[in-house]
């Protein structure tokens, strides 16, 4: 059976994006199906479609088609962002140049080389001819549109308006002239889908007929859209995988450009001292290798024969012997005059980051510009144009595309904690970058800490030394156990979440720890028909120096009698100082012989500067910090409670407040605990919760 | 943890180990590769992250080139030893995606020895 | 990035107490700093992650501080089976690692 051949490599993918027809009169045609190569297929052969199929969209959610009988550019259509669609459109309809004889040529140009409008295909005046478009099916003989529909040798034509010339060929440019790069094409982001032999190139983001390594979402900066032409590797020019299974890639021919120019954005900083990044832009004029071996000149084949010649890589600086880095490997390199040694890289010219002291921000970062593109699990970022669908979803206003360049690590949202991106991996859909805040930084985060402006109540409702024991409505109340036993205490906010503490968590391996919840007693005793015992599925550490972990629970708990949620404060609200509090916990109670009870500890929110005076001035309280005293001499957290909670209430309604950390004593007399301040942290807490994703009950 | 691959090279001759691991999937952790010459410190080269992104110290650019061959091990190729580079070379793991946001070096291999000598 | 590590070598007796110390060139992210300890011949075992957070199976006598650029490994109460050599190893932005040098122990 002859292999049906896979169209996808003619259409033009626009992620995210569908079309909404806005003329009634446009018909569309849908079907299920399982995949986009399917939807391509059928509108390349148009079967059975009532209608010249020209783009399609798949809806990935619902494992549909889509098919139009118009694009993006035409009259009454208009393009939406759409997350789970994925619009393909027919290039031969968008281009406007034409392959070869351009036989192919469906464009909208519809004016002579001599400047004659043309004369629609289906009209015999002034000329009478047999082009008519039922004889010539599938040659897209529309309107007055130039076309080629024998292949004749001129290219595309059509007859004229005027009675005196009859036909006439139309100026359509042949694409490899409209096509120009610059250097050797590394920056190239032009249109052009075909080998200088005529292969058709693959699609970058299909593994057929060649398996390779350059997929889309791992080189986001590569310009790896549909199947044109690219030289991500530094090669001599811009190349592709091929259609052909016998031939795996080829150059593409695309000119020089004629102003041999290069945009600024896609020039290396060129530095002469030190290397930046990959050392791309390093001119300056070391010559040997890291272990002093003379470089061999470039322009020179021996004693070693290679294709990185100046000629080969304009723009890359190739002059005498020096260091240089022309193919994007990791550091500037040069073949050396050891014949026996190839190639050596020049390892001993300095980092320029190294040089110049490390990347900051000041405030929150939201005016950070730096380049840093990289995640604090070292994840690199995705492009920001690809996540905006997911930005819109958090923030309520238009973020300013101007600073959303590439994929470099921004604050859109103005999060509280710095610069972040998107990573692309489902597990960390996004993460903080590690740039620190500017040292000696004062820019507050959050305004007005000691006023209480902001309200912390949205809606309703600790180890602790001396603390009476308690059962009213605390089904928030979770027991961390590490290697079947209690080790701390913790916070439900959502089904499927809870907030606890760093110090939590001695291991990485998430088999060691579970979440008990609806319990009383912390062994579990009496409290089998109330308990919920769940796996732990990651967790996701506070920002810098928050000391918080949110925990996703393998599956949602079931909220009822015996467990339920708590609520978070407003970002940055204050709360009045001598409001009343609880701290709860399983922890040590300086009890000999402890029940194992849940206790609770009563305490009072204490303003930071009273705060730190009964701390005898040792303490300087941030706005990331929250205090709270006891009534009681010596009742508070201690271990066994960290993670636990700080609950306060404030018009009716219980939240928690404060996360119970180590560091400043057990429940040592007039000495008030200092807890983190969740209110600081709410907004990273939330946005977790809305991008993470979790499992459904 | 497992490291292969150390043996006796001469100057010049590329060598590669490799670190597999079982037990735990690559794509969702980023594998560091640390070297301790003979009565020596440690030394960190490079890492291999979650989603295959590498890095490298300052002086391991160029000399070595950390890839992620499939989601169970990860390579380190030494591409012109000298003596200098006879060290017992470690795979680690820095990063796991199921705890986000707490890099450091939790489990380790045995090591496996590379000696360069003419 | 460099990490210096002091004292090279350091020396006391058992029940007694040992200070490391481990300052950076440059400020180390997020206080990403661990402690690790290895025994000739073995592989290095982590101790304490974040500066201070203490790792599996690590008695608490082992106790990190510090924030920055400075921080410091504290054994009190020195057991014989503490002899061994300590690094630190910090974490920068651009995600880079590097190691101290080391410290001996020697448990008398």
């Known amino acids: 059976q002859r292999k049906r051949r896979n169209t996808i490599h003619e259409f033009k993918k626009s992620a995210k994006t569908t079309l909404i027809k806005i003329d009634p009169a446009l018909k569309i045609k849908t079907k299920k199906v399982n995949t986009a190569d399917q939807c391509a297929n059928r509108c390349t052969r148009n079967k059975g479609l009532p209608f010249t199929c020209k783009a399609f969209v798949f809806d990935k959610a619902r494992k549909q088609c889509l098919w139009f009988p118009f694009n993006s550019m035409s009259s009454g259509v208009k393009k939406e962002f759409g997350h789970e669609f994925d619009l393909y459109e027919n290039k031969d309809y968008i281009r406007n140049c034409i392959i070869g004889k351009g036989r192919s040529y469906k464009g909208t140009v519809s004016i002579t080389k001599s400047g004659i409008k043309c004369q629609p295909w289906s009209s015999m005046i002034p000329h009478e001819h047999s082009f008519l478009p039922s004889s010539y099916r599938g040659k897209d003989l529309q309107e007055n549109y130039c076309r080629n529909p024998r292949g004749e040798e001129g290219g595309p034509w059509c007859f004229t308006s005027n009675p005196e010339v009859r036909y006439e060929v139309c100026d359509i440019p042949q694409c490899s002239e409209v096509e120009c790069m610059t250097c050797n094409g590394e920056s190239y982001r032009g249109l052009m889908d075909h080998t200088e032999s005529g292969k058709i190139c693959q699609r970058w983001d299909h593994q057929t007929p060649h398996r390779h390594k350059f997929l889309p979402e791992r080189y986001p900066d590569k310009g790896f859209d549909d199947n044109y032409c690219r030289n991500p590797d530094g090669q001599p020019r811009p190349w592709c995988y091929t259609l052909d299974p016998h031939t795996r890639w080829e150059y593409c021919a695309i000119k020089t450009c004629a102003d041999n120019t290069m945009n600024d954005t896609d020039v290396p900083l060129e530095t002469t001292e030190c290397i930046q990044g990959q050392g791309e832009g390093y001119r300056g004029t070391v010559n040997t290798i890291w272990n002093g071996i003379p470089c061999q000149r470039w322009d020179s084949q021996y004693p070693h024969e290679h294709d990185m010649t100046p000629e080969n890589f304009k723009c890359k600086d190739l002059r005498e012997n020096y260091c240089r880095n022309p193919d994007g490997s990791e550091s500037p390199w040069c073949f050396t005059t050891d014949p026996n040694i190839r190639v050596g890289y020049c390892s001993q010219i300095p980092n320029c980051d190294m040089s110049h002291g490390q990347d900051c921000y000041r405030g929150n970062g939201k005016n950070y510009m730096g380049n840093l593109s990289q995640t604090r699990s070292g994840l690199t970022c995705s492009m920001w144009d690809k996540n905006m669908e997911d930005l819109h979803r958090h923030i309520f206003w238009e973020p300013d595309a101007s600073k959303l360049n590439e994929n470099y690590c921004r604050n859109p949202d103005d999060d509280a904690h710095g610069p972040w991106c998107y990573t692309g991996n489902p597990l960390i859909p996004w993460d903080y970058c590690p740039i620190s805040r500017c040292e000696g930084d004062t820019t507050p985060t959050i305004v007005n800490l000691d006023h209480p402006v902001i309200s912390c109540a949205k809606t309703k409702q600790l180890r602790v030394v001396n603390g009476i024991p308690t059962r009213t409505n605390i089904g928030w109340m979770v027991s961390l156990r590490y290697r079947n036993k209690h080790i701390c205490g913790g916070s439900l906010i959502k089904e499927s979440w809870v907030l606890t503490a760093r110090q939590c968590f001695p291991s990485r391996d998430l088999k060691d720890y579970e979440a008990w919840l609806g319990i009383h007693d912390v062994h579990g005793r009496g409290d089998e028909k109330c308990k919920q015992v769940l796996n732990v599925s990651q967790l996701v550490y506070g920002p810098e120096g928050s000391d918080l972990v949110l925990m996703k629970l393998a599956r949602p708990a079931v909220l009822d009698d015996f467990v339920s949620t708590i609520d978070l404060p407003n970002y940055g609200c204050t709360i009045p100082e001598k409001t009343s509090c609880s701290v709860y916990g399983w922890g040590y109670t300086g009890l000999i012989n402890y029940d194992g009870l849940l206790r609770v500890a009563h305490l009072y929110i204490m303003g930071n500067e009273k705060c730190s005076q009964h701390h005898r001035g040792k303490v300087t309280l941030n706005e990331s910090e929250i205090c709270a005293g006891a009534e009681k001499i010596g009742s508070g957290p201690c271990e066994g409670d960290y993670g636990g909670p700080l609950v306060c209430e404030q018009h009716k309604m219980r939240m928690v407040l404060g996360v119970i950390v180590p560091g400043r004593g057990c429940a040592i007399p007039n000495r008030p605990g200092i807890f983190v301040r969740v209110a600081y942290y709410a907004k990273w807490i939330h946005k977790i919760i809305l991008t993470y994703k979790v499992p459904q009950s | 943890v497992e490291e292969s691959g150390g043996r006796l090279v001469t100057p010049g001759t590329p060598l590669t180990l490799t670190c597999t691991v079982s037990?735990?999937?690559?794509?969702?952790?980023?594998m560091s590769w640390v070297r301790q010459a003979p009565g020596e410190g440690l030394e960190w080269i490079g890492a291999s992250s979650i989603d295959g992104t590498t890095y490298y110290t300052n002086w391991a650019k160029g000399r070595f080139t950390i890839s992620k061959t499939s989601s169970t091990t990860v390579d380190l190729k030494i591409t012109s030893p000298t003596t200098e580079d006879t060290a017992t070379y470690f795979c680690?793991?820095?990063?796991?995606?199921?705890?986000?946001?707490?890099?450091?070096?939790?489990?380790w291999g045995q090591g496996t020895l590379v000696t360069v000598s003419s | 990035q460099v990490l210096t590590q002091t004292p090279p070598s350091v020396s006391a007796v058992v029940g007694g107490t040992v200070t490391i110390n481990c300052q950076s060139s440059q400020r180390i992210y997020s206080n990403w700093l661990s402690w690790y300890q290895q025994k000739p011949g073995q592989t290095p075992k982590p101790l304490i992650y974040a500066a201070s957070s203490l790792a599996s199976g690590v008695p608490s006598r082992f106790k990190g501080s510090g924030s920055g650029t400075q921080f410091t490994l504290t054994i009190s109460d020195l057991e014989c089976d503490d002899a061994a050599s300590y690094y630190c190893a910090g974490y920068y932005s651009g995600h880079i690692y590097s190691f101290g040098g080391g410290t001996e122990v020697v448990v008398k």
């Open positions: 037990g735990i999937d690559l794509n969702s952790n980023g």
């Open positions: 680690t793991r820095g990063e796991y995606a199921g705890v986000v946001g707490s890099n450091y070096f939790d489990l």
